[in-house]
């Protein structure tokens, strides 16, 4: 299950009103609408793990789920890079990889995912409330960033099976991205809706999953999603505490996870050990799309506990320049 922009349910036309032609004009907008809302919107997922053996050692994994080509990945901690965060590593798919202490090893795991091992000793060592952010610059989507931190040890979701976390979508640049065909489809859809407005037509009824959806709109984001639109950056900070978990773990000892997976079809595909590791159903999940952060959960992001805002003064194209993205 994932919280998305809700597509209103279209009631079938009253008999004899539009006939076969009317039926087709209803199906087509529905299909186009689904495409408009879901296509062209990449996502970034983040997983943070504290090693059971070394409590000050972290492994961060990030992945990009989009059709564009990745031109740069920046991993930072303490918030987004350029907004109070500190760069830990910069990875270019062809030019190379750079990392700075306490990063120990940054690497590409696949063409669209990276991992970073941090070892902590001394002042620069990370702790459980550290927020890690991954920013993917890609073409043609632009920059997409996600942040995650370890959930508190009391998190009940730790022993939950790996179920997808709900993710709030902030569809801005992505909706019109990628394909001209899609753009044309969306324009055509608006044209159809306008035509419907000027003649007797089936009335739009908000879907059951979003009772607050405005009746006059072709689609409306969920309440939380709307709230997300005006939260420039939100990151969940959890408290720093020792790992004292006794939770049974299939991969050798206790391990804390913060994860930002997507719906089941887009579950991050990493090595088997990673993929099968229990991921909390509810924890410090953060979805970030095109620089918009939202806490995944039922509350609107700005009411979440321990929420820290990081406005990015550089905007979605901030990764362009001498880092190999031009």
């Amino acid at each position: 299950m994932r919280t998305e922009a809700q597509v209103p349910a279209l009631q079938p036309p009253e008999p004899g009103l539009e006939g076969a032609m009317g039926h087709r004009t209803l199906v087509l907008p529905w299909v186009l609408l689904t495409l408009c809302v879901t296509a062209g919107t990449p996502e970034v997922w983040v997983q943070v793990r504290m090693e059971a053996t070394e409590l000050s050692s972290f492994t961060i994994r990030c992945g990009f789920l989009g059709s564009g080509s990745i031109s740069l990945v920046t991993v930072s901690w303490g918030g987004p890079n350029g907004a109070g965060g500190t760069t830990l590593a910069v990875l270019h798919p062809e030019r190379g990889i750079r990392q700075w202490a306490p990063a120990r090893q940054a690497r590409w795991e696949t063409q669209s995912s990276i991992s970073l091992i941090l070892e902590g000793s001394g002042a620069s060592s990370p702790c459980a409330n550290t927020t890690f952010c991954c920013k993917f610059a890609s073409f043609p989507e632009g920059s997409w960033e996600a942040c995650g931190s370890l959930p508190p040890s009391s998190d009940p979701g730790l022993s939950a099976p790996p179920t997808p976390a709900p993710i709030l979508r902030a569809d801005l640049a992505g909706i019109l991205g990628v394909s001209g065909v899609l753009l044309f489809g969306c324009v055509y859809l608006l044209h159809l809706l306008r035509r419907h407005k000027h003649r007797p037509a089936p009335r739009l009824q908000p879907s059951r999953t979003s009772p607050q959806a405005p009746r006059a709109r072709a689609w409306a984001p969920s309440q939380a999603s709307q709230a997300a639109l005006h939260v420039p950056y939100a990151t969940i900070n959890t408290s720093c505490r020792p790992a004292t978990l006794d939770t049974a773990h299939p991969h050798g000892g206790p391990s804390w996870w913060a994860s930002l997976p997507t719906h089941a079809a887009h579950r991050p595909q990493g090595p088997a050990a990673w993929a099968s590791t229990p991921i909390p159903a509810r924890g410090s999940f953060v979805s970030v799309e095109n620089g918009l952060y939202a806490q995944a959960g039922e509350r609107p992001p700005h009411t979440g506990p321990g929420l820290t805002l990081f406005p990015d003064p550089r905007g979605p194209r901030a990764m362009e320049g001498p880092l190999g993205v031009r």
């Epitope: 350029g82 590409w108 063409q111 320049g321 880092l323």
Partner: antibody
Amino acid sequence: EVQLQQSGPELVKPGASVKISCKASGYTLTDYYMNWVKQSHGKSLEWIGDINPNNGGTNFNQKFKGKATLTIDKSSSTTYMELRSLTSEDSAVYYCASLFFDYWGQGTTLTVSS
Amino acid sequence: DIVMTQSPSSLSVSAGEKVTMSCKSSQSLLNSGNQKNYLAWYQQKPGQPPKLLIYGASTRESGVPDRFTGSGSGTDFTLTISSVQAEDLALYYCQNAHSSPYTFGGGTKLEIK
């Protein structure tokens, strides 16, 4: 247009220290990750180290640890490399270069001579 | 440290000829995760700083003429100039962009007859 402007040539005595600069312009301040490279006369290039502008974090070629110190002044978008306990072996042209070596400064010639 | 070995150390060709130079690394520069080779080629003309020509073993930097081609994988790499021009007179360096320290080869000096 990205430009890396380095300080002028230096003539110093053995045992002394020198600080050469590299002023970056034409791109986002936080993107001033900088490499330093040494080229001895008639020889190849040697990577000295790099600096992260966010926190001044550095990486060094083991060979230059203790010899070079890298710092950054964000307000002037300038990176500095200080070389200490200079010997004739340190006489070379020193270049600053952007993170993935796609932009280079014009070079600073250092001559260590008594 | 990864050792980069270039050959030949110098070569002399006439304008219009095709030229190839080799670079070998002591360890593989292939990143297994994304199957990319982290090797770069630079051109350095007299009195100038090096100029990035090729990165990722085969991707031309923007503005670099298409007569320059990089190839190879793992530990063996080649820079080819399909039709040498007078302005190509320079030193050519390969560089390990895979892991620190980012070592350079000894260079190949290209002279025009």
